[in-house]
Every structure is written in structure tokens, then in C-alpha cells.
């Protein structure tokens, strides 16, 4: 492996700068944006857009950048010190219990409930009982029992007769 970082390894805004040599570890660790060499003598820069490290480390190689899945949008690109930030596309959300996939938001609330929270990239719509104000458990209701509203629009009180 070359002791110098090539211009292609650098972010566009860094390419005008002179080439950087490997730095030395500090107390056996390398700074964010680097990994340690196998002999432990050098800190080697991660490759911009390919891999990264976010903390002081003794990794033998930087961590691979995440590629956003289909159904996700890239909020910010991978840099040498930060992984890619991906977000679910509009109309879908990622649950804490299943972060590996984006799920479709429900299109509306069950009969007798009103929407109080919109679909966001990190949460489904929120429904509460009209009278009691208690939250809905989250089961998807039958289609004919659904009060629909388009994503991103506040729900208006509905006049369904019980």
C-alpha cells in the first residue's frame, strides 16, 4: 500500500491541497478518518466515498460506506469521518424494531379514530380515539373501516356515524 494518499482519495474540496503522508498513531490509536497499519506504526487515511471511521480506533481497515437501499434517499454522502445517512422515501418509515427496511405508512385511521400525527421517515401515522384520545395499537384496519387522508396533510375531524 502506498505511503501517500492519491488525489482521487480526497474530497473535491481537498484536492487542491498537497498530498498528505501517513500520520503516527497516538497512544496506539488513529484519529477519525483513518485506520491503523498492520505493523501499528502508521495511521492510513480512509478513502473518501468508499470507507470511513468516526472515532479514534485501532481498526486494521476503515468501515465500508453504507449504500442506500432502493426505497431510501441519501440525505448526506459518506465522508472519511461519517457514514452515509439514508432516509426512507416519502410515504414510508423505518421502525426502531426493524431498522433494516422501510415500511409503507398507513393511509388512514380506523373508524372512530382521528389522525394526530403524520407519516414521517421514522414513524407511521398516529391515530387516537376521537372520544378518549387514546392511541391506536397500530394494526392495519380493514379497507372499508379506514378514514383516508393524503400524506402530509393534517387530519380533519370526520363525521362518521357510529
Amino acid at each position: 500500500e502506498s505511503a501517500l494518499i492519491t488525489q482521487q482519495d480526497l474530497a473535491p474540496q481537498q484536492r487542491a491541497a498537497p498530498q498528505q503522508k501517513r500520520s503516527s498513531p497516538s497512544e496506539g490509536l488513529c484519529p477519525p478518518g483513518h485506520h491503523i497499519s498492520e505493523d501499528g506504526r502508521d495511521c492510513i487515511s480512509c478513502k473518501y466515498g468508499q470507507d470511513y471511521s468516526t472515532h479514534w480506533n485501532d481498526l486494521l481497515f476503515c468501515l465500508r460506506c453504507t449504500r442506500c437501499d432502493s426505497g431510501e434517499v441519501e440525505l448526506s454522502p459518506c465522508t472519511t469521518t461519517r457514514n452515509t445517512v439514508c432516509q426512507c422515501e416519502e410515504g414510508t418509515f423505518r421502525e426502531e424494531d426493524s431498522p433494516e427496511m422501510c415500511r409503507k405508512c398507513r393511509t388512514g385511521c380506523p373508524r372512530g379514530m382521528v389522525k394526530v400525527g403524520d407519516c414521517t421517515p421514522w414513524s407511521d401515522i398516529e391515530c387516537v380515539h376521537k372520544e378518549s384520545g387514546t392511541k391506536h395499537s397500530g394494526e392495519v384496519p380493514a379497507v372499508e373501516e379506514t378514514v383516508t387522508s393524503s400524506p402530509g396533510t393534517p387530519a380533519s375531524p370526520c363525521s362518521l356515524s357510529g
Epitope: 485506520h35 485501532d58 481498526l59 468501515l63 431498522p99
Partner: nanobody, 126 residues
């Protein structure tokens, strides 16, 4: 059910050392990264260190760099944190944690971790 049980905390003088352990009940321990976090009174839980699933390489918070060393014994399903040159500001409850499914290779934020131990108290005072 995932169970994480920390031990090894206690009271120590500044400059002293402690070794924390975390025993895991989960069979996937050997294929998962694991982390240590800490929470001082009145403060938010913060990242301390995390180690790769294969124990080859780790992350450290800048505040503990060069003083703390994380290690992992997959056969024993145990995580360790060797703490030396302890300071008053290291006083906190220390938690070990396993990440949620589908997170990065080496997670380092509280939200990326879904399984937590009950914590062990470390007090550093003269």
C-alpha cells in the same frame, strides 16, 4: 431473550484502575459488535467504546483514548473494559449494549443499540 449483566464496578481513587465485565446470554454475541456507554448523574448517556464482532479493532471516545481498552471473548460471551488512569469525570454508571439488527458495522450512538444491561456504578474519588 437478550440478557446483559455488567460487573466489576466500584469505588477507586484517581489514577486507579478497574476492569468491567459484561456477560451476555445471547448466542449471536459472537457475530455482533458490542459497546460500552456511560451515564453520569444528571447527564445523557454517552458512548465510551465499541468493538467489532470479530474483536479485530475498536472505537474509543476521545475522552477515554489511551486510558481504556475494550476486549471481547466470543467463546465466553463476555465483553470487557479495562479502565486505567481513572479521573473524577469518569464517575458514572457503565452499561454494555448490543446493537439493533441492521445497524452499521461498528455502531457508536445510543439509538443504534437496542439491548442494554442494568449497568454497574464506577465512582472515582480521593
Amino acid at each position: 431473550e437478550v440478557q446483559l449483566l455488567e460487573s466489576g464496578g466500584g469505588e477507586v481513587q484517581p489514577g486507579g484502575s478497574l476492569r468491567l465485565s459484561c456477560a451476555a446470554s445471547v448466542s449471536t454475541f459472537g457475530t455482533s459488535p458490542v459497546g460500552w456507554f456511560r451515564q453520569a448523574p444528571g447527564k445523557e448517556r454517552e458512548f465510551v467504546s465499541a468493538i467489532r464482532w470479530d474483536a479485530v479493532g475498536a472505537y474509543y471516545a476521545e475522552s477515554v483514548k489511551g486510558r481504556f481498552t475494550i476486549s471481547k471473548d466470543n467463546a465466553k460471551r463476555t465483553l470487557y473494559l479495562q479502565m486505567s488512569s481513572l479521573r473524577a469525570e469518569d464517575t458514572a454508571v457503565y452499561y454494555c449494549a448490543l446493537p439493533r439488527r441492521g445497524e452499521s458495522e461498528l455502531p457508536s450512538t445510543v439509538k443504534e443499540y437496542g439491548y442494554w444491561g442494568q449497568g454497574t456504578l464506577v465512582t472515582v474519588k480521593p
